[in-house]
């Protein structure tokens, strides 16, 4: 999906007044200094190419981000503020009902979120071009 | 282990500029944000603002907004904070400390005083 | 921004008294919520990360609850070593945010 028509200032206070406490609560007990930053992106629609790769496709280690709280929210915020994006998700979603597995916090998934974290900022910053 | 080091004392007269420093050994500098918080005489610490050293981007406190600026030489590990239109309510240590990318401080430099004196 | 009130700002104590330093905020901030020690001339000391989580090497005496708008740091029994000034800083929201401080003087 190409989200450079997203409104990425909708999206921005959707993270701002909810997603961002989520992603907290999930990282709750976690060193400040545990996951060294590794996952980075250049402008808006990258960042939110990234967000989606990391809190919805499974990993080796870490195959249950998609039914998070702030995994839900992110979702209903792509699929209100960026044209299209609902409809390309269906076979994703179909296909995530398949493989449902019991939810886990595993360590992998904590660096996973940390990076989320990172991401999120960075999608955050007032001067992030656009394009 | 982790250690930032910061710059000596400074004396400052008011609308003058003054910038510190802070060294960072012990892990890799661009794994980690810098921050800058200070503490006036008698009063609540304060969050200045913040470097990502991997891209050099700052976020500041709006307090400080226009007044501040925060880089990084990435060949020294050292972080600064310059602070300028001194007055004398800037009197006080000014701080660099650590986070990732959940933002409380475990890592503290030693504190530099800086005095902002006619 | 989200305001942090400590109280008491002031708390007079003797060796092996348990004591309570309470943090109010002033929106919800979770459990994103540190406590910190400082002492005269020195750095502050991070003693618990979210809202109860112990710093390395950071006593048992010390413990740290609450969520949402209320975070207490109680000492249990206290020694020589404790008295100090304490500060409660939020890191749910940006900017973040630290309490005015508790002194914590010896009685």
């Known amino acids: 999906y190409d989200f450079t028509n997203c409104d990425f200032e909708k999206i921005k206070a959707a993270y701002l007044s909810t997603i961002s406490k989520d992603l907290i609560t999930y990282m709750s007990g976690t060193k400040s200094t545990e996951f060294n930053n590794t996952v980075s992106c250049s402008n808006r629609p990258h960042c939110l190419t990234e967000i989606q790769s990391l809190t919805f496709n499974p990993t080796a280690g870490c195959a249950s981000l998609a039914k998070e709280m702030f995994a839900m929210k992110t979702k209903a915020a792509l699929a209100i503020w960026c044209p299209g994006y609902s409809e390309t998700q269906i076979n994703a979603t179909q296909a995530m009902k398949k493989r449902r597995k019991r939810k886990v916090t595993t360590n992998k998934c904590l660096e996973q979120v940390s990076q989320l974290q990172g991401l999120w900022r960075r999608f955050n910053r007032p001067l992030l071009k656009q394009q | 282990q982790v250690q930032l080091v910061q710059s000596g004392a400074e004396v400052k007269k008011p609308g003058a500029s003054v910038k510190v420093s802070c060294k960072a050994s012990?892990?890799?500098?661009?794994?980690?944000?810098m921050h800058w918080v200070r503490q006036a005489p008698g009063q609540r610490l304060e969050w200045i603002g913040e470097?990502?050293?991997?891209?050099?981007?700052?976020d500041y406190n709006q307090n400080f907004r226009g007044r501040v600026t925060i880089t990084v030489d990435m060949s020294a590990s050292t972080a600064y904070m310059e602070l300028s239109s001194l007055r004398s309510e800037d009197t006080a240590v000014y701080y660099c400390?650590?986070?990732?990318?959940?933002?409380?401080?475990?890592?503290w430099g030693q504190g530099t005083l800086v005095t902002v004196s006619s | 921004d989200i305001q942090l009130t400590q109280s008491p700002s002031f708390l007079s104590a003797s060796v092996g008294d348990r004591v309570t330093i309470t943090c109010k905020a002033s929106?919800?901030?979770?459990?994103?919520v540190a406590w910190y020690q400082q002492k005269p001339g020195k750095a502050p000391k991070l003693l618990i990360y979210?809202?109860?989580m112990r710093h390395t090497g950071v006593p048992s005496r010390f413990s740290g609850s609450g969520s949402g708008t209320e975070f207490t740091l109680t000492i249990s029994s206290l020694q020589p070593e404790d008295f100090a000034t304490y500060y409660c800083?939020?890191?749910?929201?940006?900017?973040?945010?630290f309490g005015q401080g508790t002194k914590l003087e010896i009685k």
């Open positions: 400390a650590l986070t990732g990318t959940i933002n409380y401080f475990d890592y």
């Open positions: 012990g892990y890799t500098f661009t794994s980690y944000l």
């Open positions: 470097i990502d050293p991997s891209d050099s981007y700052t």
């Open positions: 929106q919800d901030v979770v459990t994103a």
């Open positions: 979210w809202a109860s």
């Open positions: 800083q939020q890191y749910s929201s940006f900017t973040f945010t």
